[in-house]
């Protein structure tokens, strides 16, 4: 058993049929010695008396808020949560496996630039009695500070018969140099509590590997005289690291109709303009990627050909 | 300890092309190592990230763009002194700081070159003959060093009398390639910045 936060404890249980469970001793936080009784949750049934209560925790019925009282007055609470371990593996029931970029990916993180700011998100089908807390650091043995905000519900989607909820959190490395060469990864730890179930999820990454620039901005078209060709120009996104001559981007320019199966014109360039062939009912799209370290491409920025 | 704005004429910077080739060559070599050594811990997640130039050179700090010198987090640099003459300095206006930056890059390349050559000698003794260093990568390191053209004491190639542990050597190769790729990215950014300034 260990303390998650004040008056909240996590009991780690090997979860299998007829498991013996864990013996837990609760102590009432009071100078009183006599006349103390214990109850669980909203029940008035007295579980025991005395300053300490010893319980055998085997299942979720044994978890919950234990309260010690004296003469009708509440003295203190202890909330017990369960963390299940099945076949030596901690349970991952609360969050959905996003399976990208690989199986068992519960947390996904992205950074728009090298400033040390990043966003992580996760998915769940659970809608109520759910809380998250996020901690992060650079490295684990001698951790350097990363400050994370509160996790918030950022999107709701309908997936078949199920509703899916996306939560996200923003974090900022306390003293980040955009030009630094990372040797220690960022560690992100998410504590998830659903009713009386506790789970924790972690992710480890270098900012350079989670870079995904915002789409290029200010796309403009200029038809070329006596030609089917069009000059398309754009600018670096505002959120990208500066100076741009140091943090350079490369671009993919594509002309395509509405269907992905349609024919297309595609060209890659390090410049902020390109010449392409425009077709009726097609769109010109441009996306960006770090020129020197190939992490993710940005989403497309698009303008219609016509 | 930062790059000044006064640098060679645009498009005339002779090291840009070499640095692009360097990044390409080390990326290809790393990809080859990952594929060939698929049963070894050779991915970014599996290896320890070591920097053989740590406390010996300070390329990131010495080559910091002017715009980042206002960022306190970028300025916790170690002081290191370097020899300052080189052919990439294609302009009289080139400052001491830029010379320091380029000489730091030169020292990085020299250190990696020695490590890679020593490692290749060991890998050539491996009866499995599983992986060797790409000669193109070694040639590209050499070309960029020649373009930088700094006078510097030659570092003797490390020789070892004991029987090499090929497993350890291959893991060390992965560690070295990962670190060198990160440094090659920095070098490319620096050359691009100097070229544009």
């Amino acid at each position: 058993i260990w303390e998650l936060k004040k008056d909240v404890y996590v009991v780690e249980l090997d979860w299998y049929p007829d498991a013996p469970g864990e013996m837990v001793v609760l102590t009432c936080d009071t100078p009183e010695e006599d006349g103390i009784t214990w109850t669980l949750d909203q029940s008035s049934e007295v579980l025991g008396s005395g300053k300490t209560l010893t319980i055998q925790v085997k299942e979720f019925g044994d978890a919950g808020q234990y309260t010690c009282h004296k003469g009708g007055e509440v003295l203190s609470h202890s909330l017990l949560l369960l963390h299940k371990k099945e076949d030596g593996i901690w349970s991952t029931d609360i969050l959905k496996d996003q399976k990208e970029p690989k199986n068992k990916t519960f947390l996904r993180c992205e950074a728009k630039n090298y400033s040390g700011r990043f966003t992580c998100w996760w998915l769940t089908t659970i809608s109520t009695d759910l809380t998250f807390s996020v901690k992060s650091s650079r490295g684990s043995s001698d951790p350097q500070g990363v400050t994370c905000g509160a996790a918030t519900l950022s999107a709701e989607r309908v997936r078949g018969d199920n509703k899916e909820y996306e939560y996200s959190v923003e974090c900022q490395e306390d003293s980040a140099c955009p030009a630094a060469e990372e040797s220690l990864p960022i560690e992100v730890m998410v504590d998830a509590v659903h009713k009386l179930k506790y789970e924790n999820y972690t992710s480890s990454f270098f900012i350079r590997d989670i870079i995904k620039p915002d789409p290029p901005k200010n796309l403009q078209l200029k038809p070329l005289k006596n030609s089917r060709q069009v000059e398309v120009s754009w600018e670096y996104p505002d959120t990208w690291s500066t100076p741009h001559s140091y943090f350079s981007l490369t671009f993919c320019v594509q002309v395509q109709g509405k269907s992905k199966r349609e024919k297309k014109d595609r060209v890659f360039t390090d410049k902020t303009s390109a010449t392409v062939i425009c077709r009726k009912n097609a769109s010109i799209s441009v996306r960006a990627q770090d020129r020197y370290y190939s992490s993710s491409w940005s989403e497309w920025a698009s303008v219609p050909c016509s | 300890r930062n790059l000044p704005v006064a640098t060679p004429d645009p498009g005339m910077f002779p090291c840009l092309h070499h640095s692009q080739n360097l990044l390409r060559a080390v990326s290809n070599m790393l990809q080859k190592a990952r594929q060939t050594l698929e049963f070894y811990p050779c991915t970014s997640e599996e290896i320890d990230h070591e920097d053989i130039t740590k406390d010996k050179t300070s390329t990131v700090e010495a080559c910091l763009p002017l715009e980042l010198t206002k960022n306190e987090s970028c300025l916790n640099s170690r002081e290191t002194s370097f020899i300052t003459n080189g052919s990439c300095l294609a302009s009289r206006k080139t400052s001491f700081m830029m010379a320091l930056c380029l000489s730091s890059i030169y020292e990085d390349l020299k250190m990696y070159q020695v490590e890679f050559k020593t490692m290749n000698a060991k890998l050539l003794m491996d009866p499995k003959r599983q992986i060797f260093l790409d000669q193109n990568m070694l040639a590209v390191i050499d070309e960029l060093m020649q373009a930088l053209n700094f006078n510097s004491e030659t570092v003797p190639q490390k020789s070892s009398l004991e029987e090499p542990d090929f497993y350890k050597t291959k893991i060390k190769l992965c560690i070295l390639l990962h670190a060198f790729r990160i440094r090659a990215v920095t070098i490319d950014r620096v050359m691009s910045y100097l070229n544009a300034s």
Epitope: K263, V267, I277, K280 | -
Partner: antibody, heavy 118, light 107 residues
């Protein structure tokens, strides 16, 4: 299986014109760009131009501008390349090629040898 | 027009050995570079698109690298069926242009 089948070899006199056909099978004809390229004996490829069969849009290499005409007939899934004012240096194998991507070629015809000789 | 220069023009290789062909562009073309194989009396066949993207059906021993002005086609271990002429082609701008070809011959 996508295939491009070209017309047979031709012998032409200098100053005359030649029209080579390229019939496509497999896939929808108008879903692809169609290009023409040539290869003189012992030489590399030389790109001539492209057509979008969907709308008849064409673009020609400046070297051939005014001398080459690329057309397409959707009803027969056939593209044509006509080269006029032939000279001996136009002796080459002429290829049609296609792709959903405009700027490179994933399927090629078998080639048509055009010999220009007096 | 962008001029594409291949080297060497002829490359004698022992079967089973690796081979590398170089292609240089007269100006920077990013990764807009494609490789083809052509055997005598046959049409070209696409091997690699956009400098390094593999094409389905093409053996994995063929790989491409490069960007800007310098590109390489590598055949990791030459098989008897690989002896042919190889061409690079730029798609950075029209007119599309090809290299003059590299003939890979049996040593």
């Amino acid at each position: 299986q996508v295939q491009l089948v070209q017309s047979g070899a031709e012998v032409k006199k200098p100053g005359s014109s030649v029209k080579v056909s390229c019939k496509a099978s497999g896939g929808t004809f108008s879903d692809y760009y169609l290009h023409w390229s040539r290869q003189a004996p012992g030489q590399g490829q030389e790109w001539m131009g492209w057509i979008d069969p969907e709308n008849g849009d064409t673009e020609y290499a400046p070297k051939f501008q005014g001398r080459v005409t690329i057309t397409a007939d959707e009803s027969t899934s056939t593209a044509y390349m006509e080269l006029s004012s032939l000279r001996s240096e136009d002796t080459a194998v002429y290829y049609c090629a296609r792709n959903k991507e405009l700027r490179y070629f994933d399927v090629w015809g078998q080639g048509t040898l055009v010999t220009v000789s007096s | 027009d962008i001029v594409m220069t291949q080297s060497p023009l002829s490359l004698p290789v022992t079967p089973g050995e690796p081979a590398s062909i170089s292609c240089r562009a007269s100006q920077s073309i990013s990764i807009n570079l494609h490789w083809y194989q052509q055997k005598p009396g046959q049409q070209p066949r696409l091997l690699i698109a956009f400098a390094s993207q593999s094409i389905s059906g093409v053996p994995s021993r063929f790989s491409g690298s490069g960007s800007g002005t310098d590109f390489t086609l590598t055949i990791s271990s030459l098989q008897p069926e690989d002896f042919a002429t190889y061409y690079c082609q730029q798609s950075n701008s029209f007119p599309l242009t090809f290299g003059q070809g590299t003939k890979v011959e049996i040593k």
